[in-house]
Protein backbone atom coordinates (compact mmCIF):
# COMPACT_ATOMS: atom_id res chain seq x y z
CA UNK A 1 0.00 0.00 0.00
CA UNK A 2 1.17 3.56 -1.01
CA UNK A 3 0.93 5.92 2.23
CA UNK A 4 -1.16 8.91 1.89
CA UNK A 5 -0.44 12.01 3.65
CA UNK A 6 -2.96 14.54 5.44
CA UNK A 7 -1.88 17.41 6.65
CA UNK A 8 -3.55 19.70 9.40
CA UNK A 9 -2.98 22.36 11.64
CA UNK A 10 -3.00 21.95 15.27
CA UNK A 11 -6.17 22.91 17.09
CA UNK A 12 -8.22 22.24 13.67
CA UNK A 13 -9.76 19.71 12.26
CA UNK A 14 -9.20 17.36 10.28
CA UNK A 15 -10.45 14.85 7.75
CA UNK A 16 -9.09 11.67 6.10
CA UNK A 17 -11.34 9.78 3.49
CA UNK A 18 -10.48 6.51 2.44
CA UNK A 19 -12.21 5.52 -0.74
CA UNK A 20 -12.94 2.11 -1.60
CA UNK A 21 -14.48 -1.12 -3.70
CA UNK A 22 -18.08 -0.45 -2.13
CA UNK A 23 -19.41 -4.28 -3.73
CA UNK A 24 -15.85 -5.58 -2.76
CA UNK A 25 -16.48 -4.31 1.28
CA UNK A 26 -20.41 -5.31 0.68
CA UNK A 27 -21.67 -5.59 4.54
CA UNK A 28 -18.05 -5.14 6.02
CA UNK A 29 -17.64 -2.87 8.89
CA UNK A 30 -14.93 -0.85 8.69
CA UNK A 31 -12.10 1.11 11.56
CA UNK A 32 -9.85 3.27 11.96
CA UNK A 33 -6.55 2.12 13.79
CA UNK A 34 -2.98 3.56 14.70
CA UNK A 35 0.63 2.30 14.02
CA UNK A 36 2.29 3.13 17.54
CA UNK A 37 5.80 1.53 15.94
CA UNK A 38 7.87 -0.46 12.81
CA UNK A 39 6.73 -3.30 14.35
CA UNK A 40 3.59 -4.70 16.23
CA UNK A 41 -0.26 -4.60 15.93
CA UNK A 42 -2.30 -1.36 14.40
CA UNK A 43 -4.09 -0.37 17.65
CA UNK A 44 -7.94 0.44 16.97
CA UNK A 45 -9.27 3.62 17.60
CA UNK A 46 -12.59 3.81 16.14
CA UNK A 47 -14.90 1.57 14.07
CA UNK A 48 -18.51 2.10 12.29
CA UNK A 49 -21.96 1.41 14.43
CA UNK A 50 -22.13 -2.36 14.97
CA UNK A 51 -25.30 -2.55 12.58
CA UNK A 52 -23.42 -2.59 8.96
CA UNK A 53 -26.61 -0.52 7.65
CA UNK A 54 -26.21 1.90 10.28
CA UNK A 55 -22.77 2.64 9.13
CA UNK A 56 -23.59 6.46 8.08
CA UNK A 57 -24.36 6.65 11.68
CA UNK A 58 -21.10 9.06 13.15
CA UNK A 59 -19.46 7.16 15.98
CA UNK A 60 -16.90 8.93 18.15
CA UNK A 61 -13.99 7.93 20.16
CA UNK A 62 -12.70 11.37 21.86
CA UNK A 63 -11.90 13.50 19.08
CA UNK A 64 -11.74 11.11 16.42
CA UNK A 65 -15.06 10.01 14.55
CA UNK A 66 -16.07 7.84 11.91
CA UNK A 67 -18.57 7.58 9.44
CA UNK A 68 -18.99 5.09 6.44
CA UNK A 69 -20.89 5.89 2.80
CA UNK A 70 -21.31 2.44 2.05
CA UNK A 71 -22.69 3.15 -1.47
CA UNK A 72 -20.43 5.72 -2.33
CA UNK A 73 -17.34 3.79 -1.34
CA UNK A 74 -15.90 6.09 0.97
CA UNK A 75 -15.14 6.03 4.64
CA UNK A 76 -14.54 9.36 6.18
CA UNK A 77 -12.50 10.17 10.00
CA UNK A 78 -12.52 13.15 11.43
CA UNK A 79 -9.89 14.41 13.96
CA UNK A 80 -11.51 17.33 15.90
CA UNK A 81 -9.05 19.98 17.62
CA UNK A 82 -6.34 18.17 15.84
CA UNK A 83 -3.22 18.32 18.42
CA UNK A 84 1.05 17.01 17.99
CA UNK A 85 -0.01 14.05 19.65
CA UNK A 86 -2.27 13.18 17.01
CA UNK A 87 0.01 12.73 14.39
CA UNK A 88 1.32 9.60 13.48
CA UNK A 89 0.68 6.10 11.17
CA UNK A 90 -2.99 5.16 10.96
CA UNK A 91 -4.80 2.45 9.05
CA UNK A 92 -8.41 2.51 7.43
CA UNK A 93 -9.24 -1.16 7.72
CA UNK A 94 -12.54 -3.52 6.48
CA UNK A 95 -13.50 -5.77 8.72
CA UNK A 96 -14.50 -9.30 8.61
CA UNK A 97 -14.92 -11.99 10.78
CA UNK A 98 -10.97 -11.65 13.21
CA UNK A 99 -9.44 -10.18 9.95
CA UNK A 100 -8.58 -6.65 8.47
CA UNK A 101 -7.61 -5.58 5.10
CA UNK A 102 -5.71 -2.34 4.67
CA UNK A 103 -8.31 -0.20 2.64
CA UNK A 104 -5.71 2.72 2.68
CA UNK A 105 -2.31 3.83 4.89
CA UNK A 106 -2.40 7.23 6.06
CA UNK A 107 0.37 9.82 7.74
CA UNK A 108 -1.40 12.51 9.68
CA UNK A 109 0.79 15.45 9.95
CA UNK A 110 -0.08 18.09 12.42
CA UNK A 111 1.58 21.63 11.78
CA UNK A 112 1.85 24.19 14.61
CA UNK A 113 0.54 26.86 11.81
CA UNK A 114 -0.39 26.80 8.04
CA UNK A 115 3.03 28.90 7.51
CA UNK A 116 4.67 25.69 8.19
CA UNK A 117 3.59 23.79 4.78
CA UNK A 118 6.89 23.40 2.94
CA UNK A 119 4.95 24.75 -0.31
CA UNK A 120 3.84 27.92 1.46
CA UNK A 121 3.29 30.60 -0.91
CA UNK A 122 1.42 33.55 1.25
CA UNK A 123 -1.32 31.52 2.36
CA UNK A 124 -1.86 27.60 2.85
CA UNK A 125 -5.33 26.58 1.18
CA UNK A 126 -6.53 23.01 1.56
CA UNK A 127 -6.39 20.74 -1.59
CA UNK A 128 -3.84 18.11 -3.19
CA UNK A 129 -0.88 18.36 -3.40
CA UNK A 130 2.55 17.10 -5.41
CA UNK A 131 3.84 13.15 -4.46
CA UNK A 132 6.70 12.17 -2.44
CA UNK A 133 8.03 9.32 -3.76
CA UNK A 134 5.08 6.78 -2.95
CA UNK A 135 3.11 9.00 -0.62
CA UNK A 136 0.26 11.30 -2.00
CA UNK A 137 -0.41 14.77 0.20
CA UNK A 138 -3.61 16.05 0.92
CA UNK A 139 -4.22 19.46 2.98
CA UNK A 140 -7.59 19.13 5.05
CA UNK A 141 -8.56 22.37 6.85
CA UNK A 142 -11.31 23.47 8.38
CA UNK A 143 -12.72 26.34 10.61
CA UNK A 144 -12.56 26.32 14.48
CA UNK A 145 -15.85 25.57 16.23
CA UNK A 146 -17.44 28.88 17.32
CA UNK A 147 -18.25 28.51 21.26
CA UNK A 148 -21.27 26.40 22.28
CA UNK A 149 -21.48 25.00 18.38
CA UNK A 150 -21.87 21.33 18.14
CA UNK A 151 -20.03 20.28 15.64
CA UNK A 152 -22.10 16.87 14.94
CA UNK A 153 -25.23 15.76 15.18
CA UNK A 154 -24.73 14.10 18.00
CA UNK A 155 -24.94 10.18 17.61
CA UNK A 156 -23.55 7.03 19.69
CA UNK B 1 22.50 0.86 18.03
CA UNK B 2 20.36 4.57 17.28
CA UNK B 3 22.96 7.31 17.67
CA UNK B 4 22.66 11.18 16.36
CA UNK B 5 25.72 12.87 15.30
CA UNK B 6 26.10 16.44 15.25
CA UNK B 7 28.55 18.53 13.59
CA UNK B 8 31.23 20.79 16.10
CA UNK B 9 31.51 23.75 17.92
CA UNK B 10 31.22 26.79 15.89
CA UNK B 11 32.63 30.66 16.83
CA UNK B 12 30.78 33.42 14.78
CA UNK B 13 30.03 36.63 14.51
CA UNK B 14 27.61 38.72 15.14
CA UNK B 15 25.06 39.12 12.53
CA UNK B 16 25.93 35.88 10.43
CA UNK B 17 24.77 32.95 10.25
CA UNK B 18 25.22 29.10 10.79
CA UNK B 19 23.66 25.96 9.44
CA UNK B 20 24.56 22.89 12.05
CA UNK B 21 23.91 19.04 10.99
CA UNK B 22 22.66 16.01 12.43
CA UNK B 23 23.23 12.55 11.00
CA UNK B 24 21.27 9.62 12.12
CA UNK B 25 22.29 6.22 12.21
CA UNK B 26 20.74 2.75 13.45
CA UNK B 27 16.80 3.42 12.03
CA UNK B 28 15.42 4.74 9.07
CA UNK B 29 15.65 8.14 9.10
CA UNK B 30 12.45 9.02 7.09
CA UNK B 31 10.43 7.00 9.63
CA UNK B 32 10.89 9.44 13.00
CA UNK B 33 10.41 13.03 13.36
CA UNK B 34 13.64 15.03 14.16
CA UNK B 35 13.31 17.99 16.61
CA UNK B 36 15.81 20.56 17.86
CA UNK B 37 16.54 22.13 21.23
CA UNK B 38 18.20 24.58 22.43
CA UNK B 39 19.90 25.25 26.27
CA UNK B 40 21.81 28.19 26.66
CA UNK B 41 24.15 28.34 29.73
CA UNK B 42 23.02 26.98 32.85
CA UNK B 43 19.18 27.76 31.89
CA UNK B 44 16.41 24.98 30.93
CA UNK B 45 15.52 23.17 27.14
CA UNK B 46 13.60 25.40 24.30
CA UNK B 47 11.88 23.61 21.63
CA UNK B 48 12.83 25.63 18.81
CA UNK B 49 10.66 23.32 16.34
CA UNK B 50 10.52 19.74 14.58
CA UNK B 51 10.50 18.30 11.10
CA UNK B 52 8.95 15.58 9.36
CA UNK B 53 11.95 14.23 7.07
CA UNK B 54 9.16 11.96 5.26
CA UNK B 55 7.74 15.11 4.11
CA UNK B 56 9.33 17.79 4.75
CA UNK B 57 6.43 19.71 6.93
CA UNK B 58 8.26 21.45 9.54
CA UNK B 59 6.34 22.95 13.00
CA UNK B 60 8.15 25.89 14.69
CA UNK B 61 7.96 27.45 17.81
CA UNK B 62 6.40 30.69 17.27
CA UNK B 63 9.89 32.35 19.10
CA UNK B 64 11.84 30.89 16.81
CA UNK B 65 9.84 31.71 13.70
CA UNK B 66 12.29 33.61 11.11
CA UNK B 67 15.05 32.79 13.41
CA UNK B 68 15.57 29.10 12.78
CA UNK B 69 15.41 26.96 9.55
CA UNK B 70 14.74 23.22 9.34
CA UNK B 71 15.62 21.16 6.65
CA UNK B 72 16.40 17.33 5.56
CA UNK B 73 18.45 15.74 3.05
CA UNK B 74 16.93 12.34 2.28
CA UNK B 75 19.77 11.41 0.55
CA UNK B 76 22.23 11.92 2.89
CA UNK B 77 19.63 11.01 5.89
CA UNK B 78 20.77 14.00 7.44
CA UNK B 79 18.61 16.87 9.21
CA UNK B 80 20.01 20.45 9.60
CA UNK B 81 19.26 23.88 11.00
CA UNK B 82 19.87 27.34 10.14
CA UNK B 83 20.05 29.83 12.49
CA UNK B 84 20.39 33.37 11.09
CA UNK B 85 21.66 37.35 12.04
CA UNK B 86 22.72 36.08 15.14
CA UNK B 87 22.96 37.95 17.99
CA UNK B 88 24.65 37.29 21.93
CA UNK B 89 21.42 35.60 22.51
CA UNK B 90 21.90 32.51 20.31
CA UNK B 91 25.18 31.78 21.44
CA UNK B 92 23.96 28.51 23.39
CA UNK B 93 24.23 24.49 22.86
CA UNK B 94 21.60 23.26 20.12
CA UNK B 95 20.54 19.57 20.22
CA UNK B 96 18.87 17.80 17.71
CA UNK B 97 16.17 14.84 19.22
CA UNK B 98 14.95 11.66 17.55
CA UNK B 99 10.78 11.92 17.91
CA UNK B 100 8.59 8.61 17.69
CA UNK B 101 7.30 6.53 15.18
CA UNK B 102 5.94 9.44 12.68
CA UNK B 103 5.29 11.39 15.57
CA UNK B 104 6.75 13.27 18.59
CA UNK B 105 5.64 11.08 22.01
CA UNK B 106 8.58 12.36 24.00
CA UNK B 107 12.39 12.26 22.55
CA UNK B 108 14.00 9.09 22.86
CA UNK B 109 17.62 10.06 21.48
CA UNK B 110 19.47 13.04 21.63
CA UNK B 111 22.49 14.23 19.73
CA UNK B 112 25.70 15.40 22.02
CA UNK B 113 24.82 18.97 20.25
CA UNK B 114 26.33 21.83 19.18
CA UNK B 115 27.89 24.91 20.70
CA UNK B 116 27.43 28.23 18.95
CA UNK B 117 29.53 31.31 20.56
CA UNK B 118 28.84 34.51 18.51
CA UNK B 119 30.92 37.50 19.46
CA UNK B 120 32.99 39.81 18.02
CA UNK C 1 1.98 28.60 25.66
CA UNK C 2 1.99 25.55 28.51
CA UNK C 3 3.58 26.69 31.63
CA UNK C 4 5.69 23.83 33.19
CA UNK C 5 6.89 24.39 36.84
CA UNK C 6 8.91 22.00 38.36
CA UNK C 7 9.94 21.44 41.76
CA UNK C 8 12.29 21.88 43.45
CA UNK C 9 14.47 22.56 41.58
CA UNK C 10 17.09 22.01 43.56
CA UNK C 11 17.48 18.34 46.01
CA UNK C 12 19.94 16.49 47.55
CA UNK C 13 19.50 13.08 48.92
CA UNK C 14 21.91 9.81 49.87
CA UNK C 15 22.25 6.99 47.86
CA UNK C 16 19.31 4.15 48.48
CA UNK C 17 16.54 6.78 49.42
CA UNK C 18 13.71 7.67 47.49
CA UNK C 19 12.87 11.17 45.69
CA UNK C 20 10.24 12.55 44.11
CA UNK C 21 10.22 15.33 41.54
CA UNK C 22 7.15 17.19 40.69
CA UNK C 23 5.39 19.27 37.63
CA UNK C 24 2.73 20.97 37.44
CA UNK C 25 1.25 22.33 34.04
CA UNK C 26 -0.70 25.55 33.52
CA UNK C 27 -3.11 23.62 31.66
CA UNK C 28 -4.59 20.16 31.29
CA UNK C 29 -2.07 18.07 28.88
CA UNK C 30 -3.86 14.63 30.07
CA UNK C 31 -1.27 12.47 29.57
CA UNK C 32 1.40 13.82 27.45
CA UNK C 33 4.32 14.13 29.80
CA UNK C 34 8.30 13.27 29.26
CA UNK C 35 10.72 12.94 31.98
CA UNK C 36 14.14 13.29 30.85
CA UNK C 37 17.70 12.76 32.76
CA UNK C 38 20.63 14.85 31.82
CA UNK C 39 24.48 14.02 32.82
CA UNK C 40 27.20 15.78 31.82
CA UNK C 41 29.51 14.12 28.89
CA UNK C 42 26.27 12.04 28.21
CA UNK C 43 23.48 12.66 25.84
CA UNK C 44 20.03 13.42 27.25
CA UNK C 45 17.80 9.85 28.30
CA UNK C 46 14.34 9.85 27.73
CA UNK C 47 13.02 7.92 31.20
CA UNK C 48 9.01 8.53 31.17
CA UNK C 49 7.07 9.08 28.07
CA UNK C 50 3.13 9.70 28.59
CA UNK C 51 3.46 10.69 32.41
CA UNK C 52 4.03 6.95 33.24
CA UNK C 53 4.98 4.74 30.67
CA UNK C 54 8.89 3.69 30.97
CA UNK C 55 11.01 3.35 28.46
CA UNK C 56 13.22 0.17 27.85
CA UNK C 57 16.31 -0.27 28.81
CA UNK C 58 15.50 2.52 32.04
CA UNK C 59 15.91 0.95 35.72
CA UNK C 60 12.46 -0.12 37.19
CA UNK C 61 13.24 1.99 40.59
CA UNK C 62 12.40 5.19 38.26
CA UNK C 63 8.37 5.91 37.78
CA UNK C 64 6.22 8.60 36.66
CA UNK C 65 2.37 9.48 37.61
CA UNK C 66 -0.43 11.85 37.19
CA UNK C 67 -2.28 13.18 34.37
CA UNK C 68 -3.98 16.62 33.67
CA UNK C 69 -1.93 18.98 35.59
CA UNK C 70 0.15 17.48 38.13
CA UNK C 71 2.66 15.04 37.70
CA UNK C 72 5.72 13.20 40.17
CA UNK C 73 8.64 11.46 38.94
CA UNK C 74 9.86 9.06 41.53
CA UNK C 75 13.11 7.31 42.22
CA UNK C 76 13.26 4.71 44.79
CA UNK C 77 16.41 3.38 46.27
CA UNK C 78 18.30 5.98 44.01
CA UNK C 79 21.67 4.68 42.83
CA UNK C 80 25.40 6.71 42.50
CA UNK C 81 24.40 6.90 39.22
CA UNK C 82 21.22 8.74 39.41
CA UNK C 83 22.49 11.60 40.71
CA UNK C 84 21.92 14.14 37.64
CA UNK C 85 19.68 17.23 36.13
CA UNK C 86 15.92 16.21 35.91
CA UNK C 87 13.46 17.59 33.04
CA UNK C 88 9.80 17.42 32.33
CA UNK C 89 8.35 18.51 29.24
CA UNK C 90 4.97 18.12 27.78
CA UNK C 91 3.84 17.26 23.93
CA UNK C 92 0.41 17.84 24.68
CA UNK C 93 0.54 20.84 22.67
CA UNK C 94 2.81 23.35 20.64
CA UNK C 95 5.28 25.03 21.36
CA UNK C 96 5.99 21.38 23.62
CA UNK C 97 8.08 23.07 26.72
CA UNK C 98 10.46 21.84 28.98
CA UNK C 99 10.14 22.02 32.83
CA UNK C 100 13.18 24.26 34.24
CA UNK C 101 14.99 21.39 35.55
CA UNK C 102 15.30 19.63 39.46
CA UNK C 103 19.26 19.36 40.01
CA UNK C 104 19.47 16.29 42.23
CA UNK C 105 22.96 16.15 44.10
CA UNK C 106 24.44 13.47 46.20
CA UNK C 107 24.28 14.43 50.04
Known amino acids: HNTTVFQGVAGQSLQVSCPYDSMKHWGRRKAWCRQLGEKGPCQRVVSTHNLWLLSFLRRWNGSTAITDDTLGGTLTITLRNLQPHDAGLYQCQSLHGSEADTLRKVLVEVLADPLDHRDAGDLWFPGESESFEDAHVEHSISRSLLEGEIPFPPTS | EVQLQQSGPVLVKPGASVKMSCKPS????????MNWVKQSHGKSLEWIGS????????SYNQKFRGKATLTVDKSSSTAYMELNSLTSEDSAVYYC?????????????WGQGTLVTVSA | DVQLTQSPSYLTASPGETITINCRAS??????LAWYQEKPGKTNKLLISSGSTLQSGIPSRFSGSGSGTDFTLTISSLEPEDFAMYYCQQYSEYPFTFGSGTKLEIK
Open chain 3, 27 to 32: KSISKY
Open chain 2, 97 to 109: ARGSYYSNLGFAY
Open chain 2, 51 to 58: INPYTGGS
Open chain 2, 26 to 33: GYTFTDYY
